[in-house]
């Protein structure tokens, strides 16, 4: 039979960011590879990474068409170096993913604080919006286009002489934060969907930026 | 094609409870943020409140908060209005309407709306 | 909250004729991230529930006549009708959709003349 000795895909994991979406899975191939399928509930199969011996498949293309939909994948596996036959009727061992919804399960990606400015005893720290591979008319959406008001950003930020750590929020890309004249301070930012009850409702946090280097600028 | 249909006109007494309903179809109902409009006789639009029923989140108004809830059922694709003890102002149409596709991009689909009179 | 604030409350028109409405937002709507204006511009028509025609203070909604087009930036912003049609009386409502609570505008009367 055309499929005999082939394992059926197993472990289907979604891994997302930014909705930069990869389907992986197990085992590593041993003669055989897989092609996998993706659809939405209502729509059709369509088939991506044919033939492959890898144990993963970008599908961002596919899902970035409607983020706010569902989708399902399926991973079949064949015998290697099968070669697709119109008189094979026997379908071939598959296995199917969890349902994947990339608007309330895609991952925020690390943000970055792109600049920091302060005037007398105020601090602008600005985040960097993100660009995403979500289209609208042939342009890229940011993170912002995409989740609007249902992201914000939480600034952490503390002297750089104590560990006292100190917050602010934002539905904007920007904090206007009051500070100490004469003390250098240290930031941090971390996306957050609030509206996510789940592990993913948080990015990890920026990387640290301190007064006193190159990022910032001081006008009295 | 994507609709949003209310439930029927309600006439009630004050101090009654009430919950109006709207059924979403036609779209992926758990990612698309449902919202409550409030509309008196002869006057403007009230922005209520919202629910994203795929998490429960949900916004009030502070100027509704503690008299109305919204919920959601996200098995029957269906959100909420409830109050738990009308008053006479509470008497309006009451609108639900599905955002827009994009951040912020307005309430893209609308209900016909419910009546609700509040009369003893 | 954000106020908004529209003008005039009542707009009669010659069909044909262009229409202007403006509305102010008691803070800026513009978004710092990605430089978009959440403004929304809604029509409603007599006995109708609202319909929406503008988002982003400027993008069309998708079936909106292209005779109606949106303005502005910050807190000033307006909706202009090219040539008015019959089919255009109603109540037309700005909001702000930057931030809780959303926000609408009292509302402007387009009547025909």
């Known amino acids: 039979s055309g499929t005999t000795n082939t394992v059926a895909a197993y472990n289907l994991t979604w891994k997302s960011t930014n909705f930069k979406t990869i389907l992986e899975w197990e085992p590593k191939p041993i003669n055989q590879v897989y092609t996998v399928q993706i659809s939405t509930k209502s729509g059709d199969w369509k088939s991506k990474c044919f033939y492959t011996a890898d144990t993963e498949c970008d599908l961002t293309d596919e899902i970035v068409k409607d983020v706010k939909q569902t989708y399902l994948a399926r991973v079949f596996s064949y015998p290697a170096g099968h070669v697709e036959s119109t008189g094979s009727t026997e379908e071939p061992p598959y296995e199917n993913s969890p349902e994947f919804t990339p608007y309330l399960e895609t991952n925020l990606g690390q943000p970055t604080i792109q600049s920091f400015e302060q005037v007398g005893t105020k601090v602008n720290v600005t985040v960097q919006d993100e660009w995403t591979l979500v289209r609208r008319n042939d342009t890229f959406l940011s993170l912002r286009d995409v989740f609007g008001k249902d992201l914000i950003y939480t600034l952490y930020y503390w002297k750089s002489s104590s560990s006292g750590k100190k917050t602010a929020k934002t539905n904007t890309n920007e904090f206007l934060i009051d500070v100490d004249k004469g003390e250098n301070y240290c930031f941090s930012v971390q996306a957050v969907i609030p509206s996510r009850r789940t592990a993913n409702r948080k990015s990890t946090d920026s990387p640290v930026e301190c007064m006193g280097h190159e990022k910032g600028e001081s006008r009295e | 094609e994507v609709q949003l249909v209310q439930s029927g006109a309600e006439v009630k007494k004050p101090g009654e409870s009430l919950r109006i309903s709207c059924k979403g179809s036609g779209y992926t109902f758990i990612t698309y943020w449902i919202e409550w409009v409030r509309q008196m006789p002869g006057k403007g639009l009230e922005w209520m409140g919202d629910i994203l029923p795929g998490s429960g989140s949900t916004n009030y108004n502070e100027n509704f908060k503690g008299h109305v809830t919204i919920s959601a059922d996200k098995s029957i694709s269906t959100a909420y209005l409830q109050w738990s003890s009308l008053k006479a102002s509470d008497t309006a149409m009451y609108y639900c309407a599905r955002s827009g596709y994009y951040g912020n991009s307005g309430f893209a689909y609308w209900g016909q709306g419910t009546l609700v009179t509040v009369s003893s | 909250d954000i106020v908004m604030t529209q003008s005039p409350l009542s707009l009669p028109v010659t069909p044909g004729e262009p229409a202007s409405i403006s509305c102010k937002s008691s803070q800026s709507l513009l978004s710092s991230g990605n430089q978009k204006n959440y403004l929304t511009w809604y029509l409603q028509k007599p006995g109708q529930s609202p319909q929406l025609l503008i988002y982003w203070a400027s993008t069309r909604e998708s079936g909106v006549p292209d005779r109606f087009s949106g303005s502005g930036s910050g807190t000033d912003f307006t909706l202009k009708i090219s040539r008015v049609e019959a089919e255009d009386v109603g109540v037309y409502y700005c909001?702000?959709?930057?931030?809780?609570?959303?926000?609408f505008g009292q509302g402007t009367k387009l009547e025909i003349k």
């Open positions: 909001q702000n959709d930057y931030t809780y609570p959303l926000t």
